[in-house]
C-alpha cells in the first residue's frame, strides 16, 4: 500500500514538475527590467529564450521572436538546449511511468517489469529536473554578470550633457517557476526510485531435486526463473534492475522566428 | 467614434477643492490607459497623471502628487480627477485623453476649465 | 525631469515651402527593449485640442496627410512637413512618452508671411 502511495505521489509531483518546466520554457518573463533605483519609465521591457517583449503604460504588448539562430549568444543556447531535453526526459518518463503505475494493470506484466519501468521512470525525472535547475541557474547567472556589468556603466554621459540610461535585467517569474518545477520534478523522481525498491519481488529459491532415470545418472538442478536473466541456477537472493532503453524520439519544436535584442 | 467630455471645472480659490469627470465612449474604456493633461494660460502643455487598465498603476506630475488622485469607474466609463488644496499654479484648460501605442495620446477631450484665483 | 528643447520657437512660413522643425530631449528616447524612440508630435489649431500627428518618432498616425514626417532617434528628433499648406498653420509639440513624468516641448508656432 505505501509502495503504492509513494508510486503514485511521485507520478503526480514529476507530472507537476514537467507541467512547471514546460510552462517555465515558454513563459515570456524569463529576465524583466529591474525597476528599483530606475527612472520611472512608461515602458515596461521583459524577455524569455524565444522573444523579447515591450509593455508600454498604454496596455500595448509587443513581442518580437529572435529571428536568428546562429547570432544568439551561446549561454541561450544552452539554456534552451537544457530545458528542451529536460522537457523531452520529463515526457518519456512520464509515458514510461503510467505504465508502471502498480494501479494500472496491462495484461499479464510482472512487478519486476513494472520495477523496472518504474526505476527508469524515477531516473529520467531526476535528470529532467536537474536538467530544468541546471538551465534556470545558467540563465540566472548571466542575469547577475549582466546585472553588475550595466550598473558599473549605468548611465553613460554623451557630450556632458545628456545621458542614456541603461535598461537592466532582473529575475522573471519563469526563473522561479523553473526552478521549483525542477525541484519538483527531482522529488518526484526520487520517490519514484524509493518506490521501485518496494516493487521488485523477493525470490523464492527452490531446493534443488534429483531426478534418478534408469540407465542414466544425470541430476538436474533446476534454478529460480527470472525473467531478466534467464535460466540458471540461482542461490542469493539478487535483485537485478535494468535500466531500461532511453530514445530520444520526441523533440519539441518552437517557432523559429528569433532575433535576439 | 470616440469621444471624451469632461466636466466638472470652475472657479475655486486657493486651498479649494474640485473634481473633473471624463465620461468616454466609442471604445473599450476598461481595456484603455487614460491620462488627465493641463494647458497653462500661457499655452504649455503639462502633463498631469495617468491610470493604466486592468491594475490601475497610477502615475502622477510631482508638483500634483499628494494633491491630486485620479482614478476610473470602468461599470460607468468615466475618469476622474480629484483635486484639493489648489493652487494658482493649476489654473488650466484640463483635457482628458486616451493612451495609445507609443504612449501617445491619440484622442482629447474638449477641455474643462479650472480658475483657482481669490 | 526629461527636458524637451524645441526650436524655433516661432516660424514664418509660406505655402508650399518645406518645413522643418527640432525637438531635443535631455536623455535618449529609445528603447533597447524594440529598438524604438518613444517621442511623439502633436498639432494644436488656436482653440482646439491637440492632435496626434505622429509617435514612436516616426509612425504616422491614421488619417495624416503623409506631408507629414518625422524623424530622428535618440534625443535629436525633427518634424518635417514638405509642401506647407495653409490649414497647416499651427502650433506643433514635441512629447516625451519614455520617461514619467511625460513632458512635453514649449512648442513651435507656425505662422503664415
Known amino acids: 500500500m505505501a509502495v503504492t502511495a509513494c508510486q503514485g505521489l511521485g507520478f503526480v509531483v514529476s507530472l507537476i514538475g514537467i507541467a512547471g518546466i514546460i510552462a517555465a520554457t515558454c513563459m515570456d518573463q524569463w529576465s524583466t527590467q529591474d525597476l528599483y533605483n530606475n527612472p520611472v519609465t512608461a515602458v515596461f521591457n521583459y524577455q524569455g529564450l524565444w522573444r523579447s517583449c515591450v509593455r508600454e503604460s498604454s496596455g500595448f504588448t509587443e513581442c518580437r521572436g529572435y529571428f536568428t539562430l546562429l547570432g544568439l549568444p551561446a549561454m541561450l543556447q544552452a539554456v534552451r538546449a537544457l530545458m528542451i531535453v529536460g522537457i523531452v526526459l520529463g515526457a518519456i518518463g512520464l509515458l514510461v511511468s503510467i505504465f508502471a503505475l502498480k494501479c494500472i494493470r496491462i495484461g499479464s506484466m510482472e512487478d519486476s517489469a513494472k520495477a523496472n519501468m518504474t526505476l527508469t521512470s524515477g531516473i529520467m525525472f531526476i535528470v529532467s529536473g536537474l536538467c530544468a535547475i541546471a538551465g534556470v541557474s545558467v540563465f540566472a547567472n548571466m542575469l547577475v554578470t549582466n546585472f553588475w556589468m550595466s550598473t558599473a556603466n549605468m548611465y553613460t554621459g554623451m557630450g556632458g550633457m545628456v545621458q542614456t540610461v541603461q535598461t537592466r535585467y532582473t529575475f522573471g517569474a519563469a526563473l522561479f517557476v523553473g526552478w521549483v518545477a525542477g525541484g519538483l520534478t527531482l522529488i518526484g523522481g526520487v520517490m519514484m526510485c524509493i518506490a521501485c525498491r518496494g516493487l521488485a519481488p523477493e525470490e523464492t529459491n527452490y531446493k534443488a531435486v534429483s531426478y534418478h532415470a534408469s540407465g542414466h545418472s544425470v541430476a538436474y538442478k533446476p534454478g529460480g526463473f527470472k525473467a531478466s536473466t534467464g535460466f540458471g541456477s540461482n542461490t542469493k537472493n539478487k535483485k537485478i534492475y535494468d535500466g531500461g532503453a532511453r530514445t530520444e524520439d520526441e523533440v519539441q519544436s518552437y517557432p523559429s522566428k528569433h532575433d535576439y535584442v | 467614434e470616440v469621444q471624451l467630455v469632461e466636466s466638472g471645472g470652475g472657479l475655486v480659490k486657493p486651498g479649494g477643492s474640485l473634481k473633473l469627470s471624463c465620461a468616454a465612449s466609442?471604445?473599450?474604456?476598461?481595456?484603455?490607459?487614460v491620462s488627465w493633461v493641463r494647458q497653462t494660460p500661457e499655452k504649455r502643455l503639462e502633463w498631469v497623471a495617468t491610470?493604466?487598465?486592468?491594475?490601475?498603476?497610477?502615475y502622477y506630475l510631482d508638483s500634483v502628487r499628494g494633491r491630486f488622485t485620479i482614478s476610473r469607474d470602468n461599470a460607468k466609463n468615466t475618469l476622474y480627477l480629484q483635486m484639493s488644496s489648489l493652487r494658482s499654479e493649476d489654473t488650466a484648460m484640463y483635457y482628458c485623453?486616451?493612451?495609445?501605442?507609443?504612449?501617445?495620446?491619440?484622442?482629447w477631450g474638449q477641455g474643462t476649465s479650472v480658475t483657482v484665483s481669490s | 525631469d526629461i527636458v524637451m528643447t524645441q526650436s524655433p520657437s516661432s516660424l514664418t512660413v509660406t505655402a508650399g515651402e518645406k518645413v522643418t522643425m527640432s525637438c531635443k530631449s535631455s536623455?535618449?528616447?529609445?528603447?533597447?527593449?524594440?529598438?524604438?524612440?518613444?517621442l511623439t508630435w502633436y498639432q494644436q489649431k488656436p482653440g482646439q485640442p491637440p492632435k496626434l500627428l505622429i509617435y514612436?518618432?516616426?509612425t504616422r498616425e491614421s488619417g495624416v496627410p503623409d506631408r507629414f514626417t518625422g524623424s530622428g532617434s535618440g534625443t535629436d528628433f525633427t518634424l518635417t512637413i514638405n509642401n506647407f499648406q495653409a490649414e497647416d498653420l499651427a502650433v506643433y509639440y514635441c512629447?516625451?512618452?519614455?520617461?514619467?513624468?511625460?513632458?512635453f516641448g514649449a512648442g513651435t508656432k507656425l505662422e503664415l508671411k
Open positions: 485623453t486616451r493612451q495609445f501605442k507609443g504612449n501617445a495620446l491619440d484622442y
Open positions: 466609442g471604445f473599450t474604456f476598461s481595456n484603455s490607459a
Open positions: 491610470i493604466t487598465s486592468g491594475v490601475s498603476y497610477t
Open positions: 536623455q535618449s528616447l529609445l528603447n533597447s527593449g524594440n529598438q524604438k524612440n518613444y
Open positions: 514612436w518618432a516616426s
Open positions: 512629447q516625451n512618452d519614455y520617461f514619467y513624468p511625460l513632458t
